[in-house]
Amino acid sequence: SETTTGTSSNSSQSTSNSGLAPNPTNATTKAAG
């Protein structure tokens, strides 16, 4: 899948984790579409 960034923001999330995608793992499943 493809994601175009630059039009949305997650800076208001309360989580203290980074909003970037975590490191890939072999358990990662490809999103439909």
Epitope: S11, T29, K30
Partner: antibody, heavy 118, light 107 residues
Framework: QVQLVQSGAEVKKPGASVKVSCKAS????????MNWVRQAPGQGLEWMGE????????YFNQKFKSRVTMTRDTSISTAYMELSRLRSDDTAVYYC???????????WGQGTTVTVSS | DIQLTQSPSFLSASVGDRVTITCRAS??????LAWYQQKPGKAPKLLIY???TLHSGIPSRFRGSGSGTEFTLTISSLQPEDFATYYC?????????FGQGTKLEIK
């Protein structure tokens, strides 16, 4: 040790495409996103996008979405970035960089100079 | 998109000086700011990530601090090899954004 080795310099005409390769060694290629960053002469750093080497999922800078194609070949631990419809202002050094989730862009290729000139 | 503003854009200093570079974000990026050093003709090199964590092999004279919207990079005692351009970069959300850079020159 981690190494990212990029393909050599390119000279292209306006309207053409360029494909830059980035061969990784010294780590598990599938364990980290590969990012692409460019730097025009005398200018700052501009993020273009990244690819997940397992799923091929991609995140793009909106500015490049319509012109950039990011691919990878896990069998040879190599990522590719193709930029189409080149213009003179695409003249820049193009870098690949490994992104570690907590650490950000921790290892970089040596850069590939792309010159667009008629 | 988050915007990052570095100040100053140019900085002249001498070997042994203590220098500070500031990076301000247009919205909170928690602690997720990285700092890079770039020398002419070379790729950027990661110095600090997550605001204050020193990357492996980076000398302890480099120190990062801050969170939210204001961050600083301090070099406690400048060495000749430290004269370069420094960039901040947020790694809190997409799109990944860099500051415009700070060129550190020898006075």
């Amino acid at each position: 040790q981690v190494q990212l080795v990029q393909s050599g310099a390119e000279v292209k005409k306006p309207g053409a495409s360029v494909k830059v390769s980035c061969k990784a060694s010294g780590y598990d290629f599938t364990g980290y996103h590969m990012n692409w960053v460019r730097q025009a002469p005398g200018q700052g750093l501009e993020w273009m996008g990244e690819i997940n080497p397992i799923t091929s999922d991609k995140y793009f800078n909106q500015k490049f979405k319509s012109r950039v194609t990011m691919t990878r070949d896990t069998s040879i631990s190599t990522a590719y970035m193709e930029l189409s419809r080149l213009r003179s202002d695409d003249t820049a050094v193009y870098y690949c960089a490994r992104r570690d989730y907590g650490t950000s862009l921790d290892y970089w290729g040596q850069g590939t100079t792309v010159t667009v000139s008629s | 998109d988050i915007q990052l503003t570095q100040s100053p854009s140019f900085l002249s200093a001498s070997v042994g000086d203590r220098v500070t570079i500031t990076c301000r974000a247009s919205a909170s990026i928690s602690k997720y700011l990285a700092w890079y050093q770039q020398k002419p003709g070379k790729a950027p090199k990661l110095l600090i990530y997550a605001g204050s964590t020193l990357h492996s092999g980076i000398p302890s004279r480099f120190r990062g601090s801050g969170s939210g919207t204001e961050f600083t990079l301090t070099i406690s005692s400048l060495q000749p090899e430290d004269f370069a351009t420094y960039y901040c970069q947020q790694h809190n959300e997409y799109p990944i954004i860099f500051g415009q850079g700070t060129k550190l020159e020898i006075k």
